[in-house]
Interface confidence: low
């Protein structure tokens, strides 16, 4: 059953003479393996024998044995699928068809392939894209139907006969659907290409020449131009004439439409390949090109700059940056139209020449106040001088100049004072708009810039004030010298270090911690007595009389301070002791005897020892002594002893006399 | 000789706090308006902050706007610098300065006529 083979091969192959042929080839025979193979060349059906006629090109045997005249045609199949085949070299006279003549147990099938084989190698195809146009890429692919792993080949590009500098990309197909070697080449054609010829050679191995095919390009193009210009470098005065001509050099396909372009923009009635411009004037100075347009687009030649010269116009002036702040730079720039470019200037500050200033810019790296004003140039070229625009103002803002603090009182100022202050100053730019006083006080302005010290202090030593526009400057400090009566007045005691005793030195100092003015007068008082007028108070040898409560005053021509009182205190022993005796010095027997001893001292008293006529001491201790019942025997003179921190006294006698009592007389 | 002395200046961890000193001498300290500046490596000194010469008015840069605290103690001839919730962005040398007018221009390091040498404050993160 015929059916039942499948193969699947190229229809015809392609060779030359001395190459060889590679024919890719499967099948299928469902009902077993191959037994027998049989390559004929031109083969006939014999209806007598049932056979094929022909010449046998390859055979294999179920015992596999290859005729040695075989070894040209190879079998590179297997018994189930593929049925490759190889001849090489191939030969002119192999061409016609090829029949595989394959065999099963139960089967048999004739495959029949064209082989065609020319002379010499046949050329490849070059294909091009339907259109071609300037700077657009295309691929150019070069094709040929022949492809052997055992005869190499190259296909090779060529420009002009030159070989081409982009490299090609090169594929071969050796498959059961098609067998080919192709080369693709990315090309991005110029218009210089158009009519140029493109040929893909066929190379062997060693870059022999085999065959070629050429095609001649045609390039799609904007019109190609050249522009000319009478006179040649088209610089011109005002007056001139120039003409400008247009060239196209190559358009493909023709060209349709002209026209004139200044500063990319259309010049109306110019539709010629000429351009007539008569008595330029400064206004027609620019770029001029012609435009020619085709079916592709308009081609554009290069630029023509005319330049129209004439002398500088009415100048400007720029300033980077007004107002400008003292201190800082500024630069001036001169602005006048001119062709040429100005080769000098002039410059003026406040319509005087500034000397030495001949560049388009002035800058000035620190502004001071004087810089102020308008500035005019005046900007020359080879044509001539032009005229001097009108200017710019510079404004130089700074701080306020010369700030001073003056003092509007008569003088001296006397604490307790109203005192205004005005806040001076010489020039500023902008405008003083507030003032600043230091130090900061509750203070009144009564305007702007007076300030009004209402009961002015004695320590307000120093005003100084800030005049403020953008910024503050501010005036040196300015002494009030406030003047005022001695302060801090106090009694301090300079000798001895201890406490005073009796008998000591004492030394008193009038102390005080400021006056204004410095010179001053002291007075020392006690109890309202006037004691002395020097700073200080001395007691060679101080009594206890001299205790008491002192003040000293200071005074100067502003007015006079009292101290707060100081005491002073002097300490001695126990003095002018007496014993005095309650009710009397003589008492009734049985009756109350109080003696007393009275005494002074400073620290008081704080012992007391009492003695009788016989100087024995009595074992009584306090101030008062106490007898009671009184006793006859207790008739007699006493003394006693005081004593306290500082030492003793002792009292003269006092006698006591005891008298009997009636009843005793009576008894008797 | 006018001199500007910064102190106080180290290493600290990133939201830590750090207080930097600048003591005057040479210049009536109570006239001049001071302000605090600072200087990463490989870029312009920036302004931080400004107190006018009462004490009573303050500025301060966005990025250390409360933040920082810049106050001044004219009786010790003193401005401080409080930084709190210190970022690694904050890495610099601080430098103090001190200007003569004290209404103006306070955020240009030019318009200021002295200048400290420096303390390098470091925040790590």
């Known amino acids: 059953d015929s059916s039942k083979w499948v193969f699947e091969h190229p229809e015809t192959l392609y060779a030359w003479e001395g190459a060889c042929v590679w024919i890719p080839c499967t099948y299928r025979a469902l009902d077993g393996d191959l037994e027998s193979f049989i390559l004929f060349h031109n083969p006939e059906y014999n209806k007598n024998t049932s056979k094929f006629d022909g010449t046998r090109l390859y055979e294999s045997t179920k015992d596999g044995k290859v005729p040695s005249e075989q070894k040209r045609v190879q079998f590179l199949g297997d018994k189930n699928k593929n049925c490759t085949l190889s001849i090489h070299p191939v030969h002119l006279n192999d061409s016609g068809q090829l029949g595989l003549r394959m065999e099963s147990k139960t089967e048999k099938w004739m495959e029949r392939i064209h082989l065609n084989v020319s002379e010499r190698p046949f050329p490849p195809h070059i294909q091009l894209p339907p259109e071609i146009q300037e700077s657009q890429e295309v691929t150019l692919t070069c094709l040929l139907n022949f492809s052997c792993y055992g005869y190499p080949i190259q296909l090779q590009w060529l420009l002009e006969g030159v070989p081409m500098r982009q490299a090609a990309v090169t594929s071969t197909s050796l498959t059961i659907k098609s067998v080919f070697t192709r080369s693709e080449l990315k090309f991005s054609p110029q218009w210089s290409h158009h009519g140029k010829i493109v040929t893909c050679q066929l190379q062997d191995a060693d870059g022999k020449f085999l065959s070629n095919d050429t095609v001649q390009l045609n390039v799609k193009h904007t019109p190609k131009l050249e522009i000319k210009v009478t006179p040649s470098d088209a610089i011109v005065r005002e007056g001139d004439s120039v003409t400008m001509t247009c060239e196209v050099s190559s358009s493909n396909p023709e060209y349709t439409t002209v026209s004139w372009l200044k500063d990319g923009t259309s010049l109306k009635k110019q539709n010629t390949f000429t351009l007539n411009l008569r008595e330029v004037t400064k206004d027609q100075s620019g770029k001029y090109c012609c435009q020619v347009s085709n079916d592709v687009g308009p081609g554009r030649s290069e630029e023509v700059f005319l330049q129209v010269q004439y002398a500088p116009e009415p100048s400007t002036v720029q300033i980077l940056h007004s107002p400008a702040v003292e201190g800082s730079q500024v630069e001036f720039l001169c602005m006048s139209l001119a062709n040429p470019l100005p080769t000098n200037y002039t410059w003026y500050h406040n319509g005087k020449e500034m000397q030495g200033r001949t560049e388009e810019k002035v800058h000035i790296p620190k502004i001071l106040p004087w810089h102020a004003g308008t500035y005019s140039c005046v900007a020359e070229n080879i044509l001539g001088t032009g005229q001097r625009g009108p200017g710019a103002e510079l404004d130089v803002q700074y701080p306020p100049k010369k700030v001073t603090t003056v003092i509007q009182n008569p003088m001296p100022i006397r604490e307790g004072d109203t005192v205004t202050l005005s806040c001076n100053y010489n020039s500023s730019n902008p405008s003083v708009t507030r003032y600043e006083w230091k130090p900061h006080g509750a203070w009144e302005e009564p305007s702007l810039g007076v300030l009004k010290i209402q009961n002015v202090g004695w320590d307000n030593t120093t005003i100084a004030c800030a005049a403020c526009n953008s910024w503050c400057s501010w005036a040196s400090p300015v002494a009030l010298n406030v003047q005022y009566a001695p302060r801090d007045v106090r009694v301090r005691k300079i000798k001895p270090l201890s406490e005073i005793h009796s008998g000591n030195s004492v030394s008193l100092q009038c102390d005080f911690s400021s006056s204004h003015p410095k010179e001053v007068q002291f007075f020392w008082e006690k109890n309202g007595r006037l004691l002395g007028k020097e700073s200080q108070l001395n007691f060679d040898s101080i009594s206890p009389e001299d205790a008491g409560s002192y003040s000293c005053w200071v005074n100067n021509s502003i007015g006079q301070t009292a101290s707060k009182a100081w005491t002073l205190e002097v300490l001695y022993a126990p003095r002018r002791l007496r014993v005095s005796m309650s009710p009397g010095d003589q008492v009734m027997e049985g009756k109350s005897a109080t003696l007393t001893c009275e005494s002074d001292a400073n620290p008081p008293v704080s012992h007391y020892t009492w003695f009788d006529w016989n100087n024995q001491s009595l074992p009584y201790h306090s101030q008062k002594l106490r007898l009671e019942p009184v006793k006859v025997q207790h008739s007699g003179a006493y003394w006693c002893q005081g004593t306290n921190s500082v030492g003793k006294g002792r009292s003269p006698l006092s006698t006591l006399t005891v008298y009997y009592s009636p009843e005793t007389i009576g008894r008797r | 000789e006018v001199q500007l002395v910064e102190s106080g200046g180290g290493l600290v961890q990133g939201g830590g706090s750090l207080r930097v000193s600048c003591v005057a001498s040479?210049?009536?300290?109570?006239?001049?308006?001071m302000g605090w500046f600072r200087q990463a490596p490989g870029k312009e000194r920036e302004f931080v902050a400004a107190?006018?010469?009462?004490?009573?008015?303050?500025s301060y840069a966005d990025s250390v706007k409360g933040r920082f605290t810049i106050s001044r103690e004219n009786a010790k001839n003193t401005a401080y610098l409080q930084m709190n919730s210190l970022k690694p962005e904050d890495t610099a040398v601080y430098y103090c300065?001190?200007?003569?007018?004290?209404?103006?221009?306070?955020?240009?390091?030019?318009?200021?006529?002295?200048w400290g040498q420096g303390t390098q404050v470091t925040v790590s993160s």
């Open positions: 300065a001190a200007r003569k007018y004290s209404a103006a221009n306070v955020f240009k390091p030019n318009d200021y006529d002295y």
């Open positions: 040479g210049l009536s300290f109570s006239l001049y308006g």
């Open positions: 107190i006018n010469w009462r004490g009573d008015s303050t």
